[in-house]
């Protein structure tokens, strides 16, 4: 597709006369038709097979033509054509006398014509105009002339179409021949694949614009080269997708299980001894002064409990002070105002004068204590058991039960459930606060590992087209990684090619 | 963005319990070594620290209310509750949810819940 | 229990003056653990000064805290309009942990 471009320059008809000899009255009113055909050896009428095209009145006997409009007119004159350029053409240019305002054919009479030249040759498609000049006996006219191709049409014939864009089906603008220019960051035949972030993996990244890095499942990272761990692992690293093999001191599928919180985290604090006691849990033992579940806040005074026989304590500014019941005095309340005779001892404590009845003591029964035998004994009250036993009173004595995996008087002795190596099928065993766990390989579930679950989801080779198998250890499923143009569960599919273009 | 979340009546009657809930949301209450505190306000007065607990479910509160007081953890609703029981009118006062980091400022609060104790 | 006092109880400065508020404990205060808050009508505290000079996340630097021992100061620099409110400081280092009864600053 392109046009041929006619420019009408100067006309000469300086007697003003008709082709018949015969002058124009008052003057030639002249106006041209043009009529572009194929290549005729001699040209002769016949249908102007490549187009036809009229001026409006350019100017009487002789004149010059301006570039662009002249009275409602175009100059250059377009004749357009949606077929290849063959290179060669004929072309008629008639000079008409126009007596009134109708130009059409039929509307004038047969000797109106001026003058009719006709050429013949051949024409390359170019920018440049190829100026010519035709003289007559009595006429002459000075015209340029050439083809250029249509907008988005390229080549020699105008022939080749391209149009630039910048969607989904291409990012080119186009070379002067025709041939596609991709635009930066694309590439591909139609300028359809995106190029990647430098360093972008090429099996487990993907783009679908300019650097930009997208990853295949079970990848991650800025250049998707990391594997991406098992859904939920915690405390574990993988190899490839969907591993999760535990740092050390974590436990469990997830390795979310802290087997070592005291090591882990150091909670305790000013000095305070840790104790793990089971998952993610830990007990802090206070150097003297301090409190708090981590030990992390100084003791007040009154916090030990300094006050005897029933005295209430008090912080003050300066330390603390005791609020004495009747009968009792100093600073801690352990002197007694009262004697035998008042009976000051309670549940069948027993009565002994002091200081020649001045002051008493008590002798308490069993299970009680205090100095008025007051206070029934909880010999729990200095929490004697270890890793969380349960401190019972049992009479005179005192007895710790234990959680699990742990035995001993204080609970103080660590059962290892694991001794015994329960787990199967190489199965890893960890001591849990309630027993054992065991995490075990691929192929296996159970408590002890002992059932055989299925055999590798990847030893069928599911996966087509050269793609990289995952096994998925959670759900002993696979995944497929697709090499570059194919999708699918199991990449059987190729992308599907961009639609066909016209050339 | 770690935000809390305070909800429970703001009537309860003398020598009943008094129950609010703290909601932790933009972060989960098991991590790390925060410590999740219940403060309160007396109507024109300063502030007063009830106690914490931790995610392990370890406990410490103020020894002038550690017989009246239960803090509890609930990690499936990643929530922390206080109930105060035998209140009186005296514990009538503004009740603030906080956390601590691994000392005691709180650098996040709940909005606060006016609690008055009467019958 | 460590007993904070704070002076005065009411400061009344203008906006882009420097204002100075004191808390003073009944004890010395271990590692400095001290805290200043600011607190609004019917808001909770926030969080300015801990370590009795660190600032917290997002406070600017006008705010500012210095002191050991037993004796901490804030010091607020060019006074805004939003800086008026009652402040309170707290002690976090032995139990219980306590706060101060609090300094009100006003508009003059």
């Known amino acids: 597709s392109g046009v041929f471009q006619l420019q009408l320059q100067e006309f000469i008809n300086e007697r003003g006369v008709l082709a018949s000899g015969r002058p124009c009255e008052p003057g030639c009113r002249t106006f041209f038709r043009v009529c572009l055909k194929h290549f005729q050896a001699v040209v002769s009428p016949g249908p102007c097979t490549f187009g036809t095209v009229s001026t409006p009145v350019l100017g009487t006997n002789s004149f010059a033509v301006r570039d662009d409009s002249s009275g409602g007119g175009r100059n250059p004159l377009q004749l357009p054509f949606n077929f290849t350029w063959p290179g060669t053409f004929s072309l008629i240019i008639e000079a008409w006398h126009a007596p009134g305002d109708d130009l059409r054919p039929e509307a004038l009479p047969p000797d109106a014509l001026i003058s009719k030249i006709a050429i013949q040759g051949s024409l390359a498609v170019g920018q440049n105009w190829l100026l010519d000049e035709q003289t007559s006996t009595l006429t002459r006219l000075r015209y340029s002339y050439r083809v250029i191709c249509s907008d988005n049409y390229y080549g020699d014939n105008c022939s080749r179409l391209c149009k630039k864009r910048n969607d989904h089906f291409g990012h080119y603008v186009c070379q002067p021949d025709g041939n596609l220019s991709c635009l930066p960051g694309w590439t591909g035949e139609y300028c359809q694949q995106p190029i990647c972030l430098s360093g972008c993996h090429e099996q487990n990244g993907y783009c679908s614009k300019p650097a930009e890095c997208l990853c295949r499942p079970g990848w991650q990272g800025r250049l998707c080269n990391e594997c991406i761990p098992h859904n939920g692992c915690r405390h574990g690293t993988c190899s490839t997708p969907w591993q999760c093999t535990c740092d050390e001191g974590w436990g469990g599928l997830f390795c979310d299980q802290d087997l070592n919180y005291c090591t882990h985290h150091s909670p305790c604090k000013n000095g305070a001894t840790c104790s793990n006691s089971g998952q993610r849990s830990y007990t802090c033992t206070c150097r003297p002064g301090y409190t708090g579940v981590d030990c992390e806040l100084e003791l007040s005074e009154c916090d030990s409990n300094p006050c005897r026989n029933g005295g209430s304590c008090k912080d003050q500014e300066d330390g603390y002070h005791c609020l004495c019941p009747p009968g009792y005095y100093g600073l801690h309340c352990e002197h007694s105002t009262l004697s035998c005779a008042d009976s000051p001892c309670f549940n069948g404590g027993s009565c002994r004068e002091r200081n020649q009845g001045a002051n008493y003591a008590c002798e308490c029964p069993p299970n009680f204590t205090g100095s008025n035998c007051e206070k029934k004994v909880d010999r729990c009250t200095s929490n004697p058991c270890a890793n969380g036993g349960q401190c019972l009173n049992r009479g005179p004595s005192r007895m710790c039960r234990c959680r699990p995996g742990f035995t001993g008087t204080y609970c103080e002795l660590h059962v290892s459930d694991c001794a015994r190596n329960p787990c199967a099928h190489g199965g890893t065993c960890h001591d849990l606060e309630n027993g054992l766990m065991c995490t075990c390989p691929a192929g296996f579930s159970g408590r002890r590992c002992e059932v055989r679950t299925s055999i590798d989801a990847c030893a069928s080779s599911p996966c087509f087209n050269r793609a990289t198998c995952y096994t998925d250890l959670s759900t002993d499923t696979f995944v497929c990684n697709c090499p570059y143009g194919f999708v699918g569960s199991r990449c059987e599919f190729p992308v599907g090619l961009p639609p066909s273009f016209p050339w | 963005e770690v935000q809390l979340v305070q909800s429970g009546p703001g009537l309860v009657k003398p020598s009943q319990t008094l129950s609010l809930t703290c909601t932790v949301s933009?972060?989960?209450?098991?991590?790390?070594?925060?410590?999740w505190t219940w403060i309160r306000q007396h109507p024109g007065k300063g502030l007063e620290w009830i106690g914490y607990i931790k995610f392990s479910g370890n406990t410490y509160y103020n020894p002038s209310l550690r017989s009246r007081v239960t803090i509890s953890l609930d990690t499936s609703k990643n929530q922390f509750s206080l109930n105060m029981t035998s209140v009186t009118a005296a514990d009538t006062a503004v009740y603030y949810c906080?956390?601590?980091?691994?000392?005691?400022?709180?650098?996040?609060w709940g909005q606060g819940t006016m609690v008055t104790v009467s019958s | 229990a460590i007993r904070l006092t704070q002076s005065p109880d009411t400061l009344s400065l203008s906006p882009g003056e420097r204002a100075t508020l004191s808390c003073r404990a009944s004890v010395s205060i271990s590692n400095n653990y001290l805290a200043w808050y600011q607190q609004k009508p019917g808001q909770a505290p926030r969080l300015l000064i801990y370590g009795a000079s660190s600032r917290a996340t997002g406070i600017p630097d006008r705010f500012s805290g210095s002191g050991s021992g037993t004796d901490f100061t804030l010091t607020i620099r060019r006074l805004e309009s939003a800086d008026f409110a009652p402040y309170y400081c707290?002690?976090?280092?032995?139990?219980?942990?306590?706060f101060g009864q609090g300094t009100r600053l006003e508009i003059k």
């Open positions: 906080a956390r601590a980091p691994g000392s005691h400022n709180f650098d996040i």
């Open positions: 707290q002690q976090y280092s032995r139990s219980p942990i306590t």
């Open positions: 933009g972060g989960s209450i098991t991590s790390g070594g925060y410590y």
